[in-house]
Interface confidence: low
C-alpha cells in the first residue's frame, strides 16, 4: 500500500523544496495584531497531534501521517515548558495562568501569582495576576471564551477568575469558612470580575440556585441548579447589558449569532461539562466549530478588534479515561474549530496561537505499517505472547489483569470508541506528563514564536502583537485599514 | 454592589485642617487607582489627588505641599480598601463637594461616592 511516488527520491526532493520556497518567502509582519485568537488544546501533547493528525487522514481514506492538520499549516513554531511553580507536571489551573496572564503559578490555583497557596483562601488577595483578555477588553476590544468544558473550568477560568481552588465552581463547593472570608466562586466571577462578550460552553448548574430544574434534563435533579445563595446568575448577566442574550441549545445559539441586535452572547449548552463530540446530539448542542464560528462572528463587529480564547477541552478528558478514541477525535473536532476560524479572519490582522496546557502520557509506537488504523495492533507480539497496541499509555485505568496477565486484544476491541488502551501502572485516572508541548502560531508577530520558551512567553507575545498592557509602548504600525 | 462612603467633610475656619476618609466596600475586585475629585459651586468637577494600588501620588497643582493622600488595602479577602486626605491649611478656594473615586482593577470600572461637603470660612 505504499504509494509508489514515495519511492521515487524525486518526491522528497520536490516536496522539501516547495517547503524551502514557501519557508524564505516568510516575512515577519511589522504590524501589530488587530484580533487575538488563543486555541488550546486541552492535555493536547505532541504525540496527542501526530495521532489525531493520523486519524484525521485515515478517516479520508488516507495512509495517515501525509496529511496536514489545519494547525500544522502555521508557519511558527516554538516549544512550551510546562512546569507550575510547585510541580514539575502541572495542572490545567497553573498552566491556564501561565499563558493567559503571562505568570507561573501553583498546581489548582488560577490567575494568581505562586505567592497564594492551593485552598488557602486567605493568601488571594494582592496576589492576583490580569489576563490578556482583561488587558484586551480595557483596551476596547471585545472578548469571547469558547470551550467543550464547564465555561468555569480551569482553562477558560483563567482569562477571567481568581481563585485558590480551581474546583470552586459554585458557591456551594465553596467552604463556609473561604465563603466568609470573601472568596468567590468562579461562576459568579464569570459574571462580575469583567465584562466578557461571548461566553459559550457548559456550566449551567453552576449559575442557578439549587431546586432549579434544568431545561434539557428536567426531570434529573442532579442537573439542575446548584447555587446555595439563591442567585440566579444568568439573570444578573443578562439584566447588565441591554444586548445580551442567554441560549441554550444550537438552534438559539445559531439564530443568536445572526441577531444584529445581540451584543453579548452567553451560551450554556450543557449542565456540566458539553458532551464528547462522538456523543454530541447535533440537534441539541452545536460544536466546538459552530461556537467558534457564532464567536467570531459577534466579536469581529468590533472595529477596535477582539480577543478570543477557543479550548478543546475534552482531549484532556479522553485521555483521563485512557480512551485514545475519545481524545483523538475531540483534537480533531479542535483542529476543525482551528480551520473554520482561518476561514472568517485573515491573517494580515490576526494572531493565531495553538497551543496546549500541558501533556499525557500517551504513547503511539510499536512500529505499526504504514496505512494501519492508528487504533490498530503493532506487527507481532510481546514477550508475553500477546498483542499489543500501538497507542498506549504510561499508567491509568486501562491497567487490568485476567487471570493475574495482561489481556489479550484484538483488532476489533482496539477500534472500539469505548476501548481504553493498556497501561503500565493501574490509576483511576491517567495523568498528565510533563514534556514540552508545540505552540503553532500565524499572523502578526507570530515569528516572535521561536526556540524552547516559559509558557508564560505565550501570554507576553500575545499582549505585545495587540500592544496590551504592558507593552502599549509596542512601536508596531497599527495594520493598513485599522480602524478606531 | 461596590460602595464608596465618604466622611470627615464639615466646616473649618481658613488655615485650619480636616481629615477625609473614604471606604470602598463590597467589592467583588481588588480596587487599582483611588482618587479624590471636587466640585465648587457653579464649577466642574475637578482632580484633586490620585494614589495607585502601588502607592504611587499625585496632585493637583493648587493642593501641592497642603494636601496628602494615602490608603490602606485591607489584608482580608473582602476586598475593602480605605483612603484619605488629609488637607492643612485650608484655604477659601478649597471650598466644594468632594467626591471619592475608585476604579476596579478587573473591569476598569469607575465607582463614585456620594460626596462630602467641605467649606472653609473666613
Known amino acids: 500500500i505504499i504509494p509508489v511516488e514515495e519511492e521515487n527520491p524525486d518526491f522528497w526532493n520536490r516536496q522539501a523544496a516547495e517547503a524551502l520556497g514557501a519557508a524564505k518567502k516568510l516575512q515577519p509582519a511589522q504590524t501589530a495584531a488587530k484580533n487575538l485568537i488563543i486555541f488550546l488544546g486541552d492535555g493536547m501533547g505532541v504525540s496527542t497531534v501526530t495521532a489525531a493528525r493520523i486519524l484525521k487522514g485515515q478517516k479520508k481514506d488516507k495512509l495517515g501521517p501525509e496529511t496536514f492538520l489545519a494547525m500544522d499549516r502555521f508557519p511558527y513554531v516554538a516549544l512550551s515548558k510546562t512546569y507550575s511553580v510547585d510541580k514539575h507536571v502541572p495542572d490545567s489551573g497553573a498552566t491556564a495562568t501561565a499563558y493567559l496572564c503571562g505568570v507561573k503559578g501553583n498546581f489548582q490555583t488560577i490567575g494568581l501569582s505562586a505567592a497564594a497557596r492551593f485552598n488557602q483562601c486567605n493568601t488571594t488577595r494582592g496576589n492576583e495576576v490580569i489576563s490578556v483578555m482583561n488587558r484586551a477588553k480595557k483596551a476596547g476590544k471585545s472578548v469571547g471564551v469558547v470551550t467543550t468544558t464547564r465555561v468555569q473550568h480551569a482553562s477558560p477560568a483563567g482569562a477571567y477568575a481568581h481563585t485558590v481552588n480551581r474546583n470552586w465552581y459554585s458557591d456551594a463547593d465553596v467552604p463556609a469558612s473561604a465563603r466568609q472570608e470573601g472568596c468567590q466562586d468562579i461562576a459568579t466571577q464569570l459574571i462580575s470580575n469583567m465584562d466578557i462578550d461571548v461566553i459559550l460552553g457548559g456550566g449551567r448548574k453552576y449559575m442557578f440556585p439549587m431546586g432549579t430544574p434544568d431545561p434539557e434534563y428536567p426531570d434529573d435533579y442532579s442537573q439542575g441548579g446548584t447555587r446555595l445563595d439563591g442567585k440566579n446568575l444568568v439573570q444578573e448577566w443578562l439584566a447588565k447589558h441591554q444586548g445580551a442574550r442567554y441560549v441554550w441549545n444550537r438552534t438559539e445559539l445559531l439564530q443568536a449569532s445572526l441577531d444584529p441586535s445581540v451584543t453579548h452572547l452567553m451560551g450554556l449548552f450543557e449542565p456540566g461539562d458539553m458532551k464528547y463530540e462522538i456523543h454530541r446530539d447535533s440537534t441539541l448542542d452545536p460544536s466546538l466549530m459552530e461556537m467558534t464560528e457564532a464567536a467570531l462572528l459577534l466579536l469581529s463587529r468590533n472595529p477596535r478588534g477582539f480577543f478570543l480564547f477557543v479550548e478543546g477541552g475534552r482531549i484532556d478528558h479522553g485521555h483521563h479515561e485512557s480512551r485514545a478514541y475519545r481524545a483523538l477525535t475531540e483534537t480533531i473536532m479542535f483542529d476543525d474549530a482551528i480551520e473554520r476560524a482561518g476561514q472568517l479572519t485573515s491573517e494580515e490582522d490576526t494572531l493565531s496561537l495553538v497551543t496546549a496546557d500541558h501533556s499525557h502520557v500517551f504513547s503511539f509506537g510499536g512500529y505499526p505499517l504504514r496505512g494501519s488504523s492508528i487504533f490498530g495492533l503493532a506487527p507481532g507480539k510481546a514477550r508475553d505472547r500477546k498483542a499489543y497496541t500501538v497507542l498506549l499509555y504510561g499508567n491509568g485505568p486501562g491497567y487490568v489483569l485476567k487471570d493475574g496477565a495482561r489481556p489479550d486484544v484484538t483488532e476489533s476491541e482496539s477500534g472500539s470508541p469505548e476501548y481504553r488502551q493498556q497501561s503500565a501502572v493501574p490509576l483511576d485516572g491517567e495523568t498528565h506528563a510533563g514534556e514540552d508541548v508545540a505552540v503553532f502560531a500565524r499572523g502578526p508577530q507570530a515569528h516572535l514564536v521561536h526556540g524552547v520558551q516559559e509558557q508564560t512567553f505565550i501570554a507576553h507575545v500575545m499582549a505585545f502583537a495587540a500592544c496590551l498592557e504592558p507593552y502599549t509602548a509596542c512601536d508596531l504600525a497599527p495594520r493598513a485599514g485599522t480602524t478606531d | 454592589q461596590v460602595q464608596l462612603v465618604e466622611s470627615g467633610g464639615g466646616l473649618v475656619q481658613a488655615g485650619g485642617s480636616l481629615r477625609l476618609s473614604c471606604e470602598v466596600t463590597r467589592s467583588p475586585m481588588p480596587i487599582d487607582t483611588m482618587a479624590w475629585y471636587r466640585q465648587a459651586p457653579g464649577r466642574q468637577r475637578e482632580l484633586v489627588a490620585i494614589?495607585?494600588?502601588?502607592?504611587?501620588?499625585?496632585?493637583?497643582?493648587?493642593v501641592k505641599g497642603r494636601f496628602t493622600i494615602s490608603r490602606n488595602d485591607t489584608k482580608s479577602t473582602m476586598y475593602k480598601s480605605t483612603m484619605y486626605l488629609k488637607m492643612n491649611t485650608l484655604e477659601l478656594e478649597d471650598t466644594g463637594v468632594y467626591y471619592c473615586?475608585?476604579?476596579?482593577?478587573?473591569?476598569?470600572?469607575?465607582?463614585w461616592g456620594q460626596g462630602t461637603q467641605v467649606t472653609v470660612s473666613s
Open positions: 473615586n475608585a476604579v476596579g482593577l478587573w473591569n476598569g470600572a469607575e465607582y
Open positions: 494614589i495607585s494600588r502601588s502607592g504611587s501620588t499625585n496632585y493637583a497643582d493648587s
